[in-house]
Interface confidence: low
């Protein structure tokens, strides 16, 4: 069980971004547990007045792909694909800068919402980043 595996996404919360594509999960139970937690997080986001349209347009799919990473089809063993670091940084430092500051200072939000740490992601030019999940965030000039 500790090796992880790939399974079709069966949830609802992220279906419009992931469809029924194959996602990486570490255990049989994990998809359902994450689905419950991300549904609660999205319910909280929906009632928040602190989320701008420009942020939510990309933050929501980014959170979905962070919670349910696509399987790396190029790998011989089950492996999750990372978010792209350049997009993660633009999301955190430009599009959602105010929202991130608010979220990181609010324990209730942090309890529900799992924010990617961009520094944990592979550098853009590294081999590990070659197959990263791209959300389609416009790159800043």
């Amino acid at each position: 069980e500790e090796d992880g595996f790939c399974q079709p996404y069966r949830g609802i919360a992220c279906a419009r971004f992931i469809g029924n594509r194959t996602v990486y999960m570490e255990s049989l139970h994990m998809q359902g547990e994450i689905e419950n937690q991300i549904t609660a997080a999205f319910t909280m986001i929906g009632t928040s007045s602190h989320l701008s349209d420009k942020c939510s347009q990309f933050a929501i799919p980014s959170l979905c792909h962070y919670a349910f990473p696509y399987c790396d089809e190029t790998s011989s063993v089950p492996k999750p694909r990372d978010l792209c670091r350049d997009e993660c940084e633009i999301l955190e430092n430009v599009l959602c800068q105010t929202e991130y500051i608010f979220a990181r200072s609010n324990p209730m939000i942090l309890m529900r919402l799992k924010l990617p740490n961009c520094e944990d992601l592979p550098q853009p030019e590294s081999p590990e980043a070659a197959n990263c999940i791209r959300i389609g965030i416009p790159m800043a000039d």
Partner: nanobody
């Protein structure tokens, strides 16, 4: 080579608390998920709790509401806070990251 070293086990009375630690010799959050397993005498090893790099958690039904798993990335350490301990929680607790295992730490719950 990555090593996992558990600590924090011991003898505790029913209803008591313990906090297990698992120190990794590597940046622990680069594993997709890490977790705690346990093995009671004469029983199979079972998953207790698991946390993914995004902070998503899974708990076995028998420990839900009593145990809390967490990570401190700055210390490369995984924790298991165990409250309201019961006799049936007695086991050797193992830290796990993919195919890596710690040596285990014994938790004994007895009056």
């Amino acid at each position: 080579e990555v090593q996992l070293v558990e600590s924090g086990g011991g003898l505790v009375q029913p209803g008591g608390s313990l906090r297990l630690s698992c120190a990794a010799s590597y940046y622990i959050s680069r594993f997709y998920a890490v977790g705690w397993y346990r093995q009671a005498p004469g029983k199979q090893r079972e998953l207790v709790a698991r946390i993914s790099s995004g902070g998503w958690t899974y708990y076995a039904d028998s420990v839900k509401g009593r145990f809390t798993i967490s990570i401190d990335n700055s210390k490369n350490t995984l924790y298991l806070q165990m409250n309201s301990l019961r006799a049936e929680d007695t086991a050797v607790y193992y830290c796990n990251a993919r195919n890596l295992w710690g040596q285990g730490t014994l938790v004994t719950v007895s009056s």
